[in-house]
């Protein structure tokens, strides 16, 4: 005789799994008992149930209430059992051992696979493996997040480009008369590489971080306070250069945007005299910025 089973039994999450084990015997042979066990690699066999021709079904405590025989009429040679309400943890190898008289013992193994279905109304052809479903879901979420990021970056860059253009136009108008004078003063009073003419600065208005010529210019990109000087008593050219360095594409952080906004607001409260900025005279000499902080 021989045992008939399936190599793989596939069941949908939450459904009952039929674990088939049918003894195809020779004339006069009888099935005495069928023992079912879980036999996952690396672990000892865990008994599920014992099906006795005379005493019926005995289910092990670990599977109490979850293992049943098919209802009658039953073929006496059918050692199949039902595993109720299959969960992911049930996935694995199972073995059925059939004791027959007089032929002796037979055993066969099968693998139980538990599937998750995206839509319970869909037929089994549309069922997908839980792992595959997880991968797909993660992939979709990642793709959506990436698209969102791209949209945010594009919108931000457009916004900053517009802002920078407005600032540049405004400054260009105000500073045209003093530009040459400012540059001369810068050369005579500063050695900071950030105050060099445009041609010698590693990162231009339209440049990207990749175009930095040496690491010394990276301080422009850093978030460390010493990376920039935003003193209100700095030169016009220095402000102008910093504006160019922090133009769209340079990857500014939120903190930097706030400082940028601060510059714009501050400019309204200073006048240019001989290439330097001096505070405009006001009623009380105190300037309160948009956030209500004293400057």
């Amino acid at each position: 005789g021989e045992l008939e089973t399936s190599d793989v039994v596939t069941v949908v999450l939450g459904q009952d799994a039929k674990l088939p084990c049918f003894y195809r015997g020779d004339s006069g042979e009888q099935v005495g008992q069928v023992a079912w066990a879980r036999v996952d690699a690396g672990e000892g066999a865990q008994e599920l149930a014992l099906l006795h021709s005379k005493y019926g079904l005995h289910v092990s405590p670990a599977y109490e209430g979850r293992v049943e025989q098919p209802p009658p009429p039953r073929n006496p040679l059918d050692g199949s059992v039902l595993l109720r309400n299959a969960v992911q943890a049930d996935e694995g190898e199972y073995e059925c051992r059939v004791s027959t008289f007089p032929a002796g013992s037979f055993q066969a193994r099968l693998r139980l696979r538990v599937l998750v279905v995206l839509d319970p109304q869909e037929d089994s052809g549309k069922q997908v493996d839980l792992v595959s479903a997880s991968v797909v879901v993660v992939g979709v979420i990642a793709a959506l997040l990436f698209c969102l990021l791209v949209v945010v970056v594009v919108l931000m860059s457009r916004y900053h480009r517009r802002k920078a253009q407005q600032m540049t136009q405004k400054y260009e108008e105000e500073l045209t008369l003093t530009r040459e004078n400012s540059i001369r003063r810068l050369h005579s009073h500063h050695t900071d590489p950030r105050s060099q003419p445009e041609e010698s600065v590693g990162l231009r208005a339209e440049g990207h971080p990749d175009s930095l010529k040496d690491n010394s210019s990276c301080s422009v990109m850093s978030e460390e306070p010493e990376g920039r000087s935003y003193s209100t008593l700095t030169t016009v050219r220095e402000i102008e250069t910093q504006t160019e360095l922090l133009s769209p594409g340079s990857g500014r952080a939120e903190e930097e945007e706030d400082q940028d906004e601060g510059i714009k607001q501050a400019m309204n409260h200073f006048v240019q005299e001989n290439g330097t900025l001096r505070a405009k005279p006001t009623g009380n000499g105190i300037y309160i910025n948009g956030r209500g902080h004293l400057v």
Partner: antibody, heavy 118, light 107 residues
Framework: QVQLKQSGPNLVQPSQSLSITCTVS????????AHWVRQSPGKGLEWLGV???????DYNAAFMSRLSITKDNSKSQVFFKMNSLQADDTAIYYC????????????WGQGTSVTVSS | DFQVTQSPASLSASVGETVTITCRTS??????LAWYQQKQGKSPQLLVY???TLADGVPSRFSGSGSGTQYSLKINSLQPEDFGTYYC?????????FGGGTKLEIK
């Protein structure tokens, strides 16, 4: 080659019994059991009962009180007997071998057409 | 009472077409289901058992699928010899009822 040959009357008087013999070849009745099924004129199939290879039987509850299925392994014969036939028992009666799965019917007899009439 | 509902009751199709016949049961039958084909004046023939397993000698254009309470028989690229009546039968709890049948006719 598996074969199932049926023999029995084609006409039965109302309230009388119907007996059909199914003689099998190509397999042993100690290895495979047999089903009995009927088909009323212009209608579908109706399962009546089964005899397992060990000799135990299961019947459709609707026919249990008047149905008997037995067999003789040595003669390779299965016997079907239904009592108290009425006009609505007029049908083609089939015997069929249990298949490899232990339940489905993988080989069928030629059928016995039975008319219940006086 | 246990119900087996087969649909459609009749179906017209042309040679080469693909058709699907469905069988619904009133409770989970755990793949204990078979499909049969019967031609006029002949005995039924087993096509599929255990819901998905093709019986010996059955062409591969036939396929069974489903689980739980819903099962189907699909016939790809219909051939002239495929026309006839198809039945499903469950082997769950007694009685082992057949579906009402689906008559497949040539269009």
């Amino acid at each position: 080659q598996v074969q199932l040959k049926q023999s029995g009357p084609n006409l039965v008087q109302p309230s009388q019994s119907l007996s059909i013999t199914c003689t099998v070849s190509g397999f042993s009745l100690t290895t495979y059991g047999a089903h009995w099924v009927r088909q009323s004129p212009g209608k579908g199939l109706e399962w009546l009962g089964v005899i397992w290879r060990g000799g135990s039987t299961d019947y459709n509850a609707a026919f249990m009180s008047r149905l008997s299925i037995t067999k003789d392994n040595s003669k390779s014969q299965v016997f079907f007997k239904m009592n108290s036939l009425q006009a609505d028992d007029t049908a083609i009666y089939y015997c069929a071998k249990i298949g490899y799965d232990g339940y489905a019917m993988d080989n069928w007899g030629q059928g016995t057409s039975v008319t219940v009439s006086s | 009472d246990f119900q087996v509902t087969q649909s459609p009751a009749s179906l017209s199709a042309s040679v080469g077409e693909t058709v699907t016949i469905t069988c619904r049961t009133s409770e989970n039958i755990h793949n204990y289901l078979a499909w049969y084909q019967q031609k006029q004046g002949k005995s039924p023939q087993l096509l599929v058992y255990n819901a998905k397993t093709l019986a010996d000698g059955v062409p591969s254009r036939f396929s069974g699928s489903g689980s739980g309470t819903q099962y189907s028989l699909k016939i790809n690229s219909l051939q002239p010899e495929d026309f006839g009546t198809y039945y499903c039968q469950h082997f769950w709890s007694s009685p082992w009822t057949f579906g009402g049948g689906t008559k497949l006719e040539i269009k």
